[in-house]
């Protein structure tokens, strides 16, 4: 397995643990969601990654100005996404690069599922019965 | 001891079986146990479900219903070492859509 597909809870460096919550969020389109990570903030900075599918590699999350915001208050880092859309679906990871070892540690990930119908066509299709 | 990443969620229709894997790299006879955390309920300890079934420590829940929803976490322990815990998989139980009153084949509808 690739290294990013596995993890352990090492007894090693101070930033070898990063906790993420919640594991799963299902919300209707347009709502605001928040996900959180708790870590030893003295060990290094936190960034956010995103992937659409389970078996993809996570990519650096491009923060959409005015809609997505990352904040950090000591050990607690938060990602806030306002007005969620279907294209926000996926798994979000927080990641910390250790200052002293340059090793990278990831949280477990938060899966976001945006609920509702994505198109008018889908909505019609569900309600249509042939005459 | 390494734990491999597991799916963040699993969607199963009402009445179907749910299969949870606990992939890890232990070559020894590791002890795999399964636990459930109710979503949004941060009580400790989580509900103990029992041991895994095969060398992969699979958990199978038969005939799933709404009450089975939650986060399923496996723990792997080698000997007296402290356990490693998976990230957990959230089980989503889907109600199958109701069959339409006019549940007929396309050919019949178009006659």
């Amino acid at each position: 397995a690739r290294s990013e597909d596995r993890y352990r809870n090492p007894k090693g460096s101070a930033c070898s643990r990063i906790w993420q919550s919640p594991r799963f969020i299902a919300r209707k389109r347009g709502f605001t969601v928040k996900m959180h990570c708790y870590m030893n903030s003295a060990s290094g900075n936190v960034s956010w990654l995103w992937k659409q599918e389970m078996d993809e590699n996570p990519q650096q999350l491009k923060l959409e100005k005015g809609r997505m915001e990352e904040s950090q208050n000591e050990s607690l880092a938060t990602l806030t996404i306002q007005g969620i859309r279907f294209e926000d679906n996926g798994i979000y990871f927080c990641q910390q690069k250790c200052n002293n070892t340059s090793e990278v540690y990831q949280g477990c990930g938060t899966e976001l599922r945006v609920m509702g119908f994505s198109t008018l066509a889908q909505l019609k299709q569900r309600n249509t019965l042939k005459d | 001891l390494w734990m491999h990443k597991v799916p963040a969620s699993l969607m199963v229709s009402l009445g179907e079986d749910a299969h949870f894997q606990c992939p890890h790299n232990s070559s020894n006879n590791a002890n795999v146990t399964w636990w459930r955390v109710l979503h949004g309920n941060y009580t400790w300890p989580p509900e103990f479900l029992g041991p895994g079934e095969d060398p992969n420590g699979t958990l199978i829940i038969q005939n799933v219903n709404k009450s089975h929803g939650g986060i399923y976490v496996c723990r792997v322990q080698e000997g007296n070492e402290s356990y490693q815990q998976s990230c957990g998989t959230y089980l989503r139980v889907r109600q199958p859509p109701p069959r339409p009153f006019l549940d007929m084949g396309e050919g019949t509808k178009n006659r």
């Epitope: 643990r17 919550s21 050990s75 607690l76 | 009580t43």
Partner: nanobody
Framework: DVQLQESGGGLMQPGGSLSLTCTAS????????RAWHRQAPGKQRELVAA???????MYADSVKGRFTISRDSAKTTVSLQMDSLKPEDTAVYYC??????????WGQGTQVTVSS
Amino acid sequence: DVQLQESGGGLMQPGGSLSLTCTASISSLSIWVRAWHRQAPGKQRELVAAINSDGQTMYADSVKGRFTISRDSAKTTVSLQMDSLKPEDTAVYYCNVVTPKGQQYWGQGTQVTVSS
């Protein structure tokens, strides 16, 4: 509003032990992380130890093997057992609680001084 009540601070000799306790006026169902941070004079506040709702723990390198964090799950108590104390452990120790929704609460702090 959530109140955190710390107790157990004091003056200790190097090599001694001390136990800090913090109780939160909040339902234990509403706690994701319980932690202790500390702030030494002229330094930034830093994480000492934390325990989450899964019972997993994290420690700062400087206290590993000497400090132990634990909690009473029925109550909303978190304790920090500090053994083999060193002069560099001298600081104000703060209790920290985080809810699943990311609300963060802090105690007033309790002074720990390690000196011969």
